[in-house]
Interface confidence: low
């Protein structure tokens, strides 16, 4: 069948990293400067992706690939294949629509991005809190209160109504 | 390369279920929310709601509450809505797009899948 | 609910014109507002979010305006691939609501 498809469309015949050039007897041509084809048999080349001002070039454009970006510091990606930069927000904060804001009580965020989420409730897997929650970590379970020897206590945070950070914003 | 890329064509009778599965690559879901978005034969485009794949928490719209379910498997990086009780005013291109944990950013798409429903 | 009313719901220009969408909601959205392109057959494409920010790629005569309750989207320089259906989308509050679109037609 290739065979049979290569002798009808000479296009086939094309790697990546070249198309099939129509003012040319449809000879295969090198993509010129600042594009690429991924796949053969195209017959035009895609102009490559360009990282300006708050992006910044992760991967070099090649004839066969399309560069990546990423953003300055101080910002990081957002959405699939990092089309948009957003701002950095502190870990134990989260970004609203009002800016960084810090992580409720009984929540957490240990990133740069992302939403504050709840401290792990312990006591949902019989065990006692080891080390307390705070913004910027979560609560470190120890073993169950029933392990722990006479005296000791412990302390399991409320867990929170709903999970935080899945407001529209 | 990031892709989303969505089971195929259904056809389907009045009163019955459909599950559209969507399946992710080239990023993390964990990282972002998924929407579904559809659009009947002609007509605009309508948000029916959202999974984060991080925690499994899903947001509806009214409209379809109590008759869509979304659901993921992060293992297989994939996404499911399930829409129930079908009539035929569910003939659309049902879409999965990806956001963004702040922002409706909808900026990857799946090819979409057509849904029928008729008797 | 907020409403996203677009206008207008079609347009014919020539290649080169300027072209206005606009888009008014129901209650104020802030700036939580985004603009899709959609061709036939094809997944919307995200032009533009919160209001003005472009996303990587789209060409500079795309450019989005407007607070509150009304915004515009506004292409200076209309090229052969512009002629599609836009589409603005509120994204404030659940559930999030598109306009009713614009299909931009050659004349």
């Known amino acids: 069948f290739e065979r049979t498809r290569s002798l009808q469309d000479p296009c086939s015949n094309c790697p990546a990293g070249t198309f099939c050039d129509n003012n040319r007897n449809q000879i295969c041509s090198p993509c010129p400067p600042n594009s690429f084809s991924s796949a053969g048999g195209q017959r035009t080349c895609d102009i490559c992706r360009q990282c300006k001002g708050v992006f910044r070039t992760r991967k070099e454009c090649s004839s066969t690939s399309n560069a990546e970006c990423d953003c300055t510091p101080g910002f990081h990606c957002l959405g699939a294949g990092c089309s948009m930069c957003e701002q950095d927000c502190k870990q134990g904060q989260e970004l609203t629509k009002k800016g960084c804001k810090d992580c409720c009580f009984g929540t957490f965020n240990d990133q740069k991005r992302g939403i504050c989420r709840p401290w792990t409730n312990c006591s949902l897997d019989g065990k006692s809190v080891l080390v307390n929650g705070t913004k910027e970590r979560d609560v470190v379970c120890g073993p169950s209160p029933a392990d722990l020897s006479p005296g000791a206590s412990s302390v399991t945070p409320p867990a929170p109504a709903r999970e935080p950070g899945h407001s529209p914003q | 390369q990031v892709q989303l890329v969505q089971s195929g064509a259904e056809v389907k009778k009045p009163g019955a279920s459909v599950k559209v599965s969507c399946k992710a690559s080239?990023?993390?879901?964990?990282?972002?929310?998924i929407h579904w978005v559809r659009q009947a034969p002609g007509q605009g485009l309508e948000w029916m709601g959202r999974?984060?794949?991080?925690?499994?928490?899903?947001e509806y719209a009214q409209k379809f509450q109590g008759r869509v379910t979304m659901t993921r498997d992060t293992s297989t990086s994939t996404v499911y809505m399930e829409l129930s009780s079908l009539r035929s005013e569910d003939t659309a291109v049902y879409y999965c797009?990806?956001?963004?944990?702040?922002?409706?950013?909808?900026?990857?798409w799946g090819q979409g899948t057509s849904v029928t429903v008729s008797s | 609910d907020i409403q996203m009313t677009q206008s207008p719901s079609s347009v014919s220009a020539s290649v080169g014109d300027r072209v206005t969408i606009t888009c008014k909601a129901s209650?104020?959205?802030?700036?939580?507002l985004s603009w899709y392109q959609q061709k036939p057959g094809k997944a919307p494409k995200l032009l533009i979010y919160?209001?003005?920010r472009k996303v990587d790629g789209v060409p500079s005569r795309f450019s989005g305006s407007g607070s509150g309750t009304d915004f515009t989207l506004t292409i200076s320089s209309l090229q052969p691939e512009d002629f599609a259906t836009y589409y603005c989308?509120?994204?404030?509050?659940?559930?999030?609501?598109f306009g009713g679109g614009t299909k931009l037609e050659i004349k």
């Open positions: 080239g990023f993390n879901i964990q990282d972002t929310y």
């Open positions: 999974i984060d794949p991080a925690s499994g928490n899903s």
């Open positions: 919160r209001v003005n």
């Open positions: 797009t990806t956001g963004n944990l702040h922002y409706a950013l909808m900026d990857y």
């Open positions: 209650q104020p959205i802030n700036t939580y």
């Open positions: 989308l509120q994204y404030l509050d659940f559930p999030y609501t």
